[in-house]
């Protein structure tokens, strides 16, 4: 991927306008369609004052292990969606746009050098363990997408392009 | 149910400093940050900060930087706005407000609300 | 910083339908949270999430948010809608709440 492609807001901006048009599709979170076991998903609440104070290796912890966290759940959701019968064809598209949009923005994380903390995580932070959630609809699933992108995605990679540009 | 119970109404001097208060009631007042927004005469709401009661972090609008210190007690679940230098033009009125997360979202949005207190800026 | 803009007012006859608008640029990028406030009285979310309502709000109330504006709706308008509507984001540029100037909704007749 080119070098800090991530850092054009439009990039995350049409990653995050796909996951919402995804959420959408899935007809609300109460009547929309479940899914047939539940799915583990990353907690994707921040608490702004104190992620603002983190460094922005500790924020590059969390983000990838919620973006690996994230692809699996996703992945797992596809696996049940083919073995169920008659899966609707527009919430096969947006879980293979979704699949696809996570790998895109997995490539353009490495090139800003967020995996490298999690190889080696700052010495003074053990990154705390993940807080997780559960989903059991798409609705629900899609929602921690959108969520995780305009929120922990969004905020530390607008850190990390600030940092690059000085 | 939460309660937010505000100082009352306070006159001050231009150049002097006031401090509001908001109290907490129901549900733990640690779990969630207080936001303050202003409201002067026939105006819209304007954030002026906030405070998470758990790390003791404030943050401020520039607007405000270096002019209002927002702190937090939690012996009594109270959380406490300063504003220094008053003039003319803080005449508003003051509202704390709790902010909670509601499923689904990924940032706390303000829940609750205070009746707000008058502050007049007169000489 | 990020700028919301609405309306300075709307009229509806009671029983109508309301639509209040909020623009920002990019607007569908971020979440819109509704606030509703009566004279005298401190603001009440109405509307968070772009579209959820908090439990108490009336069915009536309901939100969107694509192409450049977030919308608020209310339908079957009743005497006591009449209020201030008030929109809001979380600028995560400047890391501050912004409200929009707000609408006072006047309610006819």
């Known amino acids: 991927a080119p070098p800090r492609l991530i850092c054009d807001s439009r990039v995350l901006e049409r990653y995050i306008l796909e996951a919402k048009e995804a959420e959408n599709v899935t007809m609300g979170c109460a009547e929309g369609p479940r899914l047939s076991e539940n799915i583990t998903v990353p907690d994707t609440k921040v608490n702004f004052y104190a992620w603002k104070r983190m460094k922005v290796e500790e924020q590059a912890v969390e983000v990838w292990q919620g973006l690996s966290l994230l692809s699996e759940a996703i992945l797992q959701a596809q696996a049940l969606q083919a073995n169920s019968s008659q899966p609707p064809e527009s919430l096969q598209l947006h879980i293979d746009k979704a699949i696809s949009g996570l790998r895109s923005l997995t490539s353009l994380l490495r090139v800003l050098g967020a995996q490298k903390e999690l190889m080696s995580p700052p010495d003074a932070t053990q990154a705390a363990p993940l807080r997780t959630l559960t989903a059991d609809t798409f609705c629900k699933l899609f929602r921690v997408y959108s969520n995780f992108l305009r929120g922990k995605l969004k905020l530390y990679t607008g850190e990390a392009c600030r940092r690059g540009d000085r | 149910q939460v309660q937010l119970v505000q100082s009352g109404a306070e006159v001050k001097k231009p150049g002097s400093s006031v401090k509001v208060s908001c109290k907490a009631s129901?549900?733990?007042?640690?779990?969630?940050?207080i936001s303050w927004v202003r409201q002067a005469p026939g105006q819209g709401l304007e954030w002026m900060g906030g405070?998470?009661?758990?790390?003791?972090?404030?943050d401020y609008a520039q607007k405000f930087q270096g002019r209002v210190t927002i702190t937090a007690d939690e012996s009594t679940s109270t959380a406490y706005m300063e504003l220094s230098s008053l003039r003319s033009e803080d005449t508003a009125v003051y509202y704390c407000?709790?902010?909670?997360?509601?499923?689904?979202?990924?940032?706390?949005?303000?829940?609750?609300w205070g009746r707000g207190t008058l502050v007049t800026v007169s000489s | 910083s990020y700028v919301l803009t609405q309306p300075p007012s709307v009229s509806v006859a009671p029983g109508k339908t309301a639509r209040i608008t909020c623009s920002g640029d990019?607007?569908?990028?971020?979440?819109v949270h509704w606030y509703q406030q009566k004279p005298g009285q401190a603001p009440v979310l109405v509307i968070y999430?772009?579209?959820e309502r908090p439990s108490g709000i009336p069915e009536r109330f309901s939100g969107s948010n694509s192409g450049n504006t977030a919308t608020l709706t209310i339908s079957r308008v009743e005497a006591g809608d009449e209020a201030d509507y008030y929109c809001?984001?979380?600028?995560?540029?400047?890391?501050?709440?912004?409200f929009g100037g707000g609408t006072k909704l006047t309610v006819l007749g």
């Open positions: 407000a709790r902010e909670l997360y509601y499923p689904g979202t990924w940032m706390a949005v303000m829940a609750y």
């Open positions: 129901g549900g733990t007042f640690r779990s969630y940050a």
């Open positions: 405070i998470d009661p758990i790390s003791g972090f404030a």
């Open positions: 990019n607007i569908p990028e971020y979440y």
């Open positions: 999430r772009d579209n």
């Open positions: 809001q984001v979380f600028d995560e540029s400047s890391w501050h709440w912004v």
